[in-house]
């Protein structure tokens, strides 16, 4: 007689990443009886919510429900109905909401309140909506990539099942770039972490990890651009800003009120004799790079060494996974290959930024102009941040791996967050019981 397939004993989880520029919903799945095994949870769906980040709904909170509908309905379709009630839903908001909270705690709470009200209308088990800290964002990103790379597994393998696997248990560092903040997280080599705020201690699967992390608020790619514009307009002689970070022939009108809307530009704020100014692109990588460097204060460091703005950074150690906007931008620029040296990346950026705007628009006709116009700045910013901000060198550049997905799951903080909140990362190594692992043939 033929064996009848038993119903799949699986569980699901949903995490919404409420970022500064957009919200994404992730659905994860895992075998119910293997919850404590490492590497069993994987992503089955990503749904990008149409529209901006939730912090932009502050004056129209009643629209949040409609905004979330499509992706929540998608989750309803993907997850079997019998599992709906059991499926936890978490929403974590990042730096966009941190910035809103800095301006008004009441407004930030109003947004989260409406988020809860909207998500409570679905049949899932809603667990909470909150603003995660920068430290958590860094830590959970680090957990995600190392979980997916199999770094927490005690089983050594003679074959490689994941990309970038160096077949050792050395963890990867995590480099995360968002729209409003950027995180750097790694295990330093025998180095004391000189500032307690940047130190994390984990015990995962029976092993202790001393992890360094820092989140630079206002140094995500979008807020960094606002900072740069606010800094440069201070010294402009009129309402024309000739900007090396935009392609030659590019023109855009910016409202001064929009420029000063974010707390990230407060330090550059001044009374200007005009309400609007026009960006005129001149497309010069070197000048753009120089302008970006002025955002990093490297003159002050109260520690043995710093990244910038007086923030402690230990010597870099090991390999790093660079994900989120680090990956999206470099992927667009076709610079994610392991074979491309830092010098080659710089060369390519020089050429790209110098290309006339009309030419760029023709070459990338399918790309929204808003995004297309900013790749020169974003690519240059990534190089500046990694080289001057975090002190990567031409030699250590090869230790940076630009990662979008690992084993089909997106690199980012959401998986680590869910693993932690559902208690799926044990402190101790689970005892191997018979039949608890698949048999290798």
């Amino acid at each position: 007689t033929q064996n009848k397939a038993l119903p799949e004993n699986v569980k699901y989880g949903i995490v919404l990443d409420a970022g500064s520029s957009h919200t994404s919903l992730y659905i994860y799945k895992w075998p119910a009886e293997k919850e404590n095994d490492t590497g069993v949870v994987h992503q089955v769906e990503e749904c990008r919510v149409k529209g901006p980040g939730i912090s932009k709904f502050v004056q129209k909170v009643n629209e949040i429900g409609i905004y979330l509908t499509d992706c929540m309905e998608r989750a309803r379709e993907v997850i079997p109905r019998s599992q709906h009630q059991e499926t936890p839903v978490y929403l974590g908001a990042t730096a966009g909401m941190r910035l809103l909270r800095m301006e008004s705690e009441e407004l930030a709470d109003r947004v989260l309140d409406v988020v809860e009200r909207s998500l409570s209308n679905y049949p899932f088990d809603f667990q909470g909506a909150r603003i995660i800290t920068g430290q958590e964002e860094g830590a959970y990103g680090w957990i995600t990539i190392n979980y997916l790379l199999g770094k927490f597994s005690q089983k050594t393998r003679w074959f490689s099942i994941v990309p970038y696997e160096t077949n050792n248990q050395e963890t990867f560092g995590a480099l995360d770039l968002g729209g409003a903040s950027t995180q750097v997280t790694f295990v330093p080599q025998n180095q004391t972490i000189e500032s307690p705020d940047n130190a994390l201690q984990f015990r995962l699967y029976g092993k202790d990890y001393n992890v360094y992390t820092h989140s630079f608020l206002c140094y995500g790619k979008d807020q960094a651009l606002w900072q740069k514009l606010a800094k440069d307009i201070q010294v402009a002689s009129n309402e024309i800003l000739r900007d090396p970070c935009f392609h030659p022939g590019y023109k855009k009108v910016v409202n001064v009120s929009d420029l000063y809307k974010t707390p990230c530009t407060k330090r550059f704020e001044m009374t200007l004799p005009f309400q609007q100014f026009e960006i005129q692109g001149i497309g010069n990588y070197q000048q753009c790079h120089q302008s970006i460097l002025e955002l990093f204060n490297t003159s002050y460091c109260p520690y043995s060494q710093c990244a910038f703005n007086g923030i402690f950074l230990p010597p870099l150690q090991g390999d790093f996974g660079a994900f989120s906007a680090f990956y999206f931008v470099m992927k667009f620029l076709n610079l994610t290959s392991e074979k491309v040296s830092q010098e080659k990346v710089t060369e390519m950026m020089k050429k790209f930024c110098a290309q006339p705007w009309e030419e760029i628009k023709t070459s990338y006709a399918g790309v929204k102009e808003k995004y297309l116009s900013e790749y020169c700045f974003s690519g240059t910013y990534i190089l500046s941040l990694l080289l001057q901000g975090y002190h990567f060198t031409a030699d250590s550049w090869e230790h940076i791996h630009f990662i979008g997905k690992i084993q089909g799951s997106d690199a980012g903080w959401t998986l680590g967050y869910m693993l932690n909140l559902t208690n799926m990362i044990p402190a101790e190594q689970p005892l191997s019981t018979p039949l608890s692992h698949s048999t290798y043939v």
Partner: nanobody
Amino acid sequence: EVQLLESGGGLVQPGGSLRLSCAVSRGTFSEYSMSWFRQAPGQERDFVTAISGFGHITHYADSVKGRFTISRDNSKNTVYLQMNSLRAEDTAVYYCAAAWQTSPRRMMQMAGSITWGQGTQVTVSS
């Protein structure tokens, strides 16, 4: 970790009303689902009601539905239990409980990591 302090307990006649309060210190209050449990002498601790971080999800034990109402004021970091039409069988020590990023449904099942208050005595007697 959050700290919880209940108040408002006391002696009340059958059919009467009482409002319990639970003040929460430390932590970000809206990140916690809040709950009330009760324990009668010689009995297990039983679930009464729970409420989500911003108050849009509530669950009640069948025995108190329509009589008890849970609410919260996030500006005051306080959760309330309004108890009406009290009965002798409602006599118990009432405990406030908090669970971080945990649904009211899971609190009802006593799942997740729960922080407890010291309890306040409610006696319903004529």
